[in-house]
């Protein structure tokens, strides 16, 4: 997250970290059910671990943390590497979470976002770009949903209805390492960090997010079929 600020503790209990061994964070994810996460399809790895209820980036033990294995990862069948359409994936955890103030699911919004909606994006991704500098704790940033026209103008021929753009002033954006993490609008999960320009936070080059309102049926049906 570029030019965000430290999230208040316990305010993002759905935020998950996807880790490669030993404890390398490579993507964010979102708890949407007691045993299921959503993340970006481009975050798929065969071997990874899931950390929930953790505030700092470092692997130091925190009393609220819960660790999991992913037993199933189900990318949206319409995703096409290295493209960006349909960039979402469900991960089934090896057990249900223990709900606490630090670990709690969030509902996926069935309403599509309108321009001007205020949202919050969070993650442990780099706080500088193109340099790489990772934060000590989870970062939060207020962003506004842009109109689809502004989105398409920013990225001609690259935007479809499975994506939306959001941003703020130049210099504020999500970035590498935030992928798969949540965009929360009006208390519901509206999007996932998907892609954007490089370096991040360039003028007139907003972040692009998976438009989850288009996938509520797929999410529900996939969880039901695999539970």
């Amino acid at each position: 997250i570029i030019n965000g600020s430290d999230c208040d503790m316990h305010t993002q209990p759905w935020q998950a970290a996807l880790l490669l061994r030993p404890n390398q964070l490579y993507c964010g994810a979102v708890l949407v059910h007691p045993q299921w996460l959503l993340t970006a399809a481009h975050c798929r790895k065969k071997v990874f671990r899931v950390r929930l209820g953790h505030y700092s980036l470092s692997p130091v033990y925190e009393s609220g943390q819960q660790m999991f294995q992913g037993v199933k990862s189900i990318p949206h069948p319409g995703y096409s590497h290295p493209g960006h359409s349909n960039d979402l994936m469900l991960i089934k955890l090896n057990r249900r979470i223990r709900p606490t103030k630090d670990v709690r699911p969030i509902n996926v919004s069935s309403h599509c976002p309108s321009a001007g909606t205020k949202c919050l994006v969070s993650g442990w991704g780099t706080t500088k770009s193109p340099q790489v500098h990772f934060p000590k704790v989870l970062q939060c940033l207020n962003i506004s949903v842009l109109s689809q026209k502004r989105c398409e103008d920013a990225y001609p021929r690259q935007i479809d209805d499975t994506m939306f753009c959001a941003g703020d002033k130049a210099g504020r954006d999500s970035c590498q390492g935030d992928s798969g993490g949540p965009v929360v609008c009006n208390g519901s999960l509206q999007g996932l960090v998907s892609w954007g320009d490089y370096p991040c936070a360039r003028p007139n080059r907003p972040g692009v997010y998976t438009n989850l309102c288009k996938f509520t049926k797929w999410i529900q049906e996939t969880i039901q079929a695999n539970s």
Epitope: L20, K45, K46, N94
Partner: antibody, heavy 117, light 110 residues
Framework: EVQLQESGPGLVKPSGTLSLTCAVS????????MSWVRQPPGKGLEWIGD???????DYASWAKGRVTISQDKSKTQVSLKLSSVTAADTAVYYC???????????WGQGTLVTVSS | AYDMTQSPSSLSASVGDRVTITCQAS??????LAWYQQKPGKAPKLLIY???TLASGVPSRFKGSGSGTDFTLTISSLQPEDFATYYC????????????FGGGTKVEIK
């Protein structure tokens, strides 16, 4: 050097159990999923199953109930057991490492197991 | 079922030819497809993963493309060392799968 080496008896009697081990060197089993694949003489590749560092195991549907895959991370080896074998289980058996992006990037040389009385 | 069907099962070609092998999945596997080359008496070798990413050390004449259900491996200019059997493998799911591999395509000298 990253290496995989399968070993086990080359001949197994019908109705017996085929047991193979795959010795792993040059990388930690805790970081990778491992696969077993077989190839009957003159035929194509057949996936048998995968084992993950967490000891979660996926088996091919034909292998469920007959196959057991396990690992010993301290001994850095992966094992395959196939019970109630018939002549149709005669094949070259390979172990392989997944590159974490769903491609098998390191393979053992394979070991031929013949099922015959 | 996620069955993988390769075609053709065999083909004859000459050095320098452009060769195309196809792999079709019975359901969408997104981009989780790998290609392997196998020579007689040897273990398979990974060529391409994620449908189009070249594995380390693989010559650039090998190219993978496709997504969803239809995938292609193209060898732009066949070299003598490319005569071998090629297999595709889906990595989308392991649930209730008989085989993740396609049946293979043997590339022979014309």
């Amino acid at each position: 050097e990253v290496q995989l080496q399968e070993s086990g008896p080359g001949l197994v009697k019908p109705s017996g159990t085929l047991s193979l081990t795959c010795a792993v060197s040059g990388f930690p089993l805790s970081n990778y999923a491992m696969s077993w694949v077989r190839q009957p003489p003159g035929k194509g590749l057949e996936w048998i199953g995968d084992i993950y560092p967490s000891d979660i195991i996926d088996y091919a549907s034909w292998a469920k109930g007959r196959v057991t895959i396990s690992q010993d991370k301290s001994k850095t080896q992966v094992s395959l057991k196939l019970s109630s074998v018939t002549a149709a289980d005669t094949a070259v058996y390979y172990c392989a490492r997944d590159n974490n992006d769903y491609g098998l990037d390191i393979w053992g040389q394979g070991t031929l197991v013949t099922v015959s009385s | 079922a996620y069955d993988m069907t390769q075609s053709p099962s065999s083909l004859s070609a000459s050095v320098g030819d452009r060769v195309t092998i196809t792999c079709q999945a019975s359901q969408s596997i997104s981009s989780w497809l790998a290609w392997y080359q196998q020579k007689p008496g040897k273990a398979p070798k990974l060529l391409i993963y994620l449908a189009s990413t070249l594995a380390s050390g693989v010559p650039s004449r090998f190219k993978g493309s496709g997504s969803g259900t239809d995938f292609t491996l193209t060898i732009s200019s066949l070299q003598p060392e490319d005569f071998a059997t090629y297999y595709c493998q889906q990595g989308y799911t392991n649930s209730n799968i008989i085989n993740t591999f396609g049946g293979g395509t043997k590339v022979e000298i014309k």
